[in-house]
């Protein structure tokens, strides 16, 4: 049961850390103007991974995306590509952890197969989680230098009488979005893995072979003292092939009209 | 058609208070930035306040802020500036105005007449 | 606070010339998110409330003649009207839209001969 929990939250959690990364890479708000000098003004701006916007007091807010493929600073394009690597990776993990989820039985789809599939959505999801901390620390990393060279740039050139206002931007929304849903999708992978570890047959149980010598009737079972005495085995998750009695999360049915969602 | 029409002005001695009102029509009201612009007798157009859209910022000039009190009743289509401790250097000719693109302002009423004397 | 200084304080023309006032902001009025300038020009006809002609510097207000011409960038705009007529007699003004608070040009008065 606590096997079928973890797995279970383990989907839960990835699921909610995928719709996270979805959403941060959608939003506008990756950055935003920094308000420390002016905190009243009428022009807003703010930027996303594929455009930028401008909200007036007047509520009327324009947004032009970024045409340009070529003329995109390299980092940009990065975090871009680990972003929509993330959101892959989490889907394909999506779809396998779905046919890999211990509640939901497809034909006589074996423990060792669901247990192979947990890890494989598992570790989809470490990395999709990865991808996205990785994309939005690098876009955070940018932000920062950036905002100390246009700091830098707006104490220099005051000789005259004219004052040009550089925008500098700081986090935005998105980012704190990014890295909730990475580290959720993470925490889900990893949930699916402990998950894998108990769903994994420790070893394979064949039904007893007897063998009889003369003299002596000894029945002989592969898998050596472990095997034969039942102690450090893990019971519950061990297919026993013998016809023998099995446990509420053993029982294997055959397919309904309610197995298949 | 768009119109403004704003009342509630008049003569009020220093230190007084008053509230001017704005009944917008013609427009939906509540989709749009409101400000109060004011035009004193050497023809010098001053910004004296601005309410956003849902109402929940005001922004005002450091000459009025404290005094002057913007807001707005999108139910009854209005705008409201109440004035408090009035000064003489607030006689002036008010103005409501409506914020379009590029924050400037397309509406303006026909004005009401503020006079502070004692 | 942006300052906004308008020049000159008036004009003396005669119908049918072309007419150039100058504005100039103490702060640039660009906006780097969107390249525009948040400038608007105003002409109050005496007796009545200002009319907007231009906002974004140089977007026309509709309904406004084309002989209206608004342009620059930046610190300093400019206002032309390239063939004045009678009705264009007014007061123009410039304001600053792009931070609080908000600020007029003194306005330049427009004279017939």
């Known amino acids: 049961m606590a096997v079928t929990a973890c797995q279970g939250l383990g989907f839960v959690v990835s699921l909610i850390g995928i719709a996270g990364i979805i959403a941060a890479t959608c939003m506008d708000q990756w950055s935003t103007q920094d308000l420390y000098n002016n905190p009243v003004t009428a022009v807003f701006n703010y930027q996303g991974l594929w455009r930028s916007c401008v909200r007036e007091s007047s509520g009327f807010t324009e947004c032009r995306g970024y045409f340009t493929l070529l003329g995109l600073p390299a980092m940009l394009q990065a975090v871009r590509a680990l972003m929509i690597v993330g959101i892959v990776l989490g889907a394909i993990g999506l779809l396998v952890s779905i046919f890999a989820l211990k509640c939901i039985r497809i034909g006589s789809m074996e423990d060792s197969a669901k247990a192979n599939m947990t890890l494989t959505s598992g570790i989809m999801f470490i990395v999709s989680g990865l991808c996205a901390i990785a994309g939005v620390s690098v876009f955070a990393n940018m932000l920062v230098t950036n905002f100390w060279m246009s700091t830098a740039n707006m104490y220099t050139g005051m000789g005259g009488m004219v004052q040009t206002v550089q925008t500098r931007y700081t986090f935005g929304a998105a980012l704190f979005v990014g890295w909730v849903a990475g580290g959720l999708t993470l925490i889900g992978g990893v949930m699916m893995c402990i998950a894998c570890r108990g769903l994994a047959p420790e070893e394979t149980n064949y039904k007893a072979v007897s063998y009889h010598a003369s003299g002596h009737s000894v029945a002989y079972k592969p898998g050596g003292f472990k095997a034969s005495t039942g102690f450090g085995s893990n019971t519950k998750n061990k297919k026993i092939y013998d016809g023998g009695a099995r446990t509420e999360d053993e029982v294997q049915s055959y397919p309904s009209k309610h197995d298949y969602v | 058609d768009v119109k403004l029409v704003e009342s509630g002005g008049g003569l009020v001695k220093p230190g007084g208070s008053l509230k001017l009102s704005c009944a917008a029509s013609g427009f939906t009201f509540s989709s749009y930035t409101m400000s109060w612009v004011r035009q004193t007798p050497e023809k010098r157009l001053e910004w004296v306040a601005t309410?956003?859209?849902?109402?929940?910022?005001?922004y005002y000039p450091d000459s009025v802020k404290g005094r002057f009190t913007i807001s707005r009743d999108n139910a009854k289509n209005t705008l409201y500036l109440q004035m408090s401790s009035l000064k003489s250097e607030d006689t002036a000719m008010y103005y409501c105005?409506?914020?379009?693109?590029?924050?400037?302002?397309?509406?303006w009423g026909q004005g009401t007449s503020v006079a502070v004397s004692s | 606070d942006i300052v906004m200084t308008q020049s000159p304080s008036s004009l003396t023309v005669t119908t049918g010339e072309k007419v150039t006032m100058s504005c100039k902001s103490s702060?640039?009025?660009?906006?780097?998110?969107?390249?525009?300038?948040?400038l608007s020009w105003y002409q109050q006809i005496p007796g009545q409330p200002p009319k907007l002609l231009f906002y974004w510097a140089s977007t026309r207000e509709s309904g406004v003649p084309d002989r209206f011409t608004g342009s620059g960038s930046g610190t300093d705009f400019t206002l032309t009207i390239s063939n004045v007529q009678a009705e264009d007699l007014a007061v123009y003004y410039c304001?600053?839209?792009?931070?609080?608070?908000?600020?007029f040009g003194a306005g330049t008065k427009l004279e017939l001969r």
């Open positions: 105005t409506r914020l379009v693109k590029g924050n400037a302002m397309d509406y």
């Open positions: 702060q640039s009025l660009l906006n780097s998110g969107n390249q525009k300038n948040y």
């Open positions: 304001q600053n839209d792009y931070s609080y608070p908000f600020t």
């Open positions: 309410i956003i859209i849902g109402g929940s910022y005001t």
